[in-house]
């Protein structure tokens, strides 16, 4: 089941997906002055059996300008701009994206693309949040939203993290900075 | 069904302490922000803070800083509100609200009055 | 702390008619602003958040717009049951503040 909506925007941060559920779709996208070939797929798709994953199709771009010529899917990183999914700079990755059965990797980048990611997320998939530069978590607790079905409808927890600009002093007045551990993710309102 | 529930309403003398609670339900108690929110009679709503239950990490409004301490146990899905000397300008309406940002469930509401 | 301003203070309307209310901020605030209305003795209900998104459940009447400092909330068709108190409030930069309110009465 594809989730209606994107995972919630919060003030200041970023969310990226250290992996994806199978059913997860990312558009074939060019960047401008560039189109999908002709006859070329319209999306990549993860799919997989029960020991492994991976992306089906494969996106190609090729000049606006020319009809003939053909942009082989390899990896450039000058090609790697920022996305809505840019790799996290988080020294702590909360998944290995190896490990997690019936997940595909983020797919490496193709010649050309467009410098935003658009995927179709589903139900079960988890992305992760951390404040933009220039901004800091205001605790360690949960960082994540997790797209629900509740009563039929697909919907987002909200992600529980505030993230306040680098002139506040490193420690808030009156902030009480416990010793315990990041709490489990947000789970969403039990049933009606 | 989400529901924040409120103790009762308070009538103090200056000088007193207080604490009034906040029940959280229907949802994961732990893992959202609870803020508070003053309302004096007769006028808008103030923002006075917010603590997060899983850790007790709190933080306070400029305003409130010094005056009023949050706290919560997550065993009873419970936040508090704290006052060790109540003053005449605490009458007010307090509403306890699931965060963090936009504020999507409130509480009732608990009425503290402070009257000699 | 970011000000948040609302106009007008009070209006007076009648059942029908389109109603505007404005929400100032003394700075940007992007799109992170929700609207909430408040009847009297009861606590306060979200209507809108990220500036124009519907919270589930509240009437279609009910719009809101804008992004940066100026915002606006909308309601379409005044009914009987809109007759409240309109808070806006920030969320960009924390401490979160609320507008002073704006009173929708009876004309």
């Known amino acids: 089941e594809l989730c209606d909506d994107d995972p919630p925007e919060i003030p200041h941060a970023t969310f990226k997906a250290m992996a994806y559920k199978e059913g997860t779709m990312l558009n074939c996208e060019c960047k401008r002055g560039f189109r999908r070939i002709k006859s070329g797929s319209l999306y990549m798709l993860c799919t997989g059996n029960s020991s492994h994953s991976s992306w089906d199709n494969q996106c190609q771009c090729t000049s606006s300008a020319t009809r003939n010529t053909t942009k082989q899917v390899t990896p450039q990183p000058e090609e790697q701009k920022e996305r809505k999914t840019t790799e996290m700079q988080s020294p702590m990755q909360p998944v290995d994206q190896a490990s997690l059965p019936g997940h595909c990797r983020e797919p490496p980048p193709w010649e050309n693309e467009a410098t935003e990611r658009i995927y179709h997320f589903v139900v079960g998939q988890m992305v992760y949040y951390q404040c933009v530069q220039g901004y800091r978590a205001l605790h360690r607790g949960p960082a994540e939203s997790v797209c629900k079905m509740t009563h039929g409808k697909t919907r987002w927890t909200q992600p529980q993290l505030i993230c306040t600009g680098e002139m506040e002093t490193s420690q808030f007045p009156g902030e009480e900075k416990p010793q315990a551990s990041p709490e489990g993710r947000p789970e969403s309102e039990t049933s009606c | 069904e989400v529901q924040l529930v409120q103790s009762g309403a308070e009538v103090k003398k200056p000088g007193e302490s207080l604490k009034i609670s906040c029940k959280g339900s229907?949802?994961?108690?732990?893992?959202?922000?609870i803020g508070w929110v003053r309302q004096m009679p007769g006028k808008g709503l103030e923002w006075m803070g917010i603590?997060?239950?899983?850790?007790?990490?709190?933080k306070y409004s400029p305003s409130f800083q010094g005056q009023v301490t949050f706290s919560a146990d997550k065993s009873t899905s419970t936040a508090y509100l704290q006052w060790s000397s109540l003053q005449a300008s605490d009458t007010a309406m307090y509403y306890c609200?699931?965060?963090?940002?936009?504020?999507?469930?409130w509480g009732q509401g608990t009425l503290v009055t402070v009257s000699s | 702390d970011i000000q948040m301003t609302q106009s007008p203070s009070t209006l007076s309307a009648s059942v029908g008619d389109r109603v505007t209310i404005t929400c100032r901020a003394s700075?940007?605030?992007?799109?992170?602003l929700a609207w909430y209305q408040q009847k009297p003795g009861k606590a306060p209900k979200l209507l809108i958040y990220k500036a124009s998104s519907l919270e589930s459940g509240v009437p279609s009447r009910f719009s809101g717009s804008g992004s940066g400092t100026e915002f606006t909330l909308t309601i379409s068709s005044l009914q009987p049951d809109d007759f409240a108190t309109y808070y806006c409030?920030?969320?960009?930069?924390?401490?979160?503040?609320f507008g002073q309110g704006t009173k929708v009465e009876i004309k």
């Open positions: 409030q920030q969320y960009s930069s924390y401490s979160w503040t």
């Open positions: 603590i997060s239950p899983g850790d007790s990490t709190t």
């Open positions: 700075q940007s605030v992007s799109s992170w």
């Open positions: 229907g949802y994961s108690f732990s893992n959202y922000w």
């Open positions: 609200v699931r965060g963090p940002y936009y504020l999507d469930y």
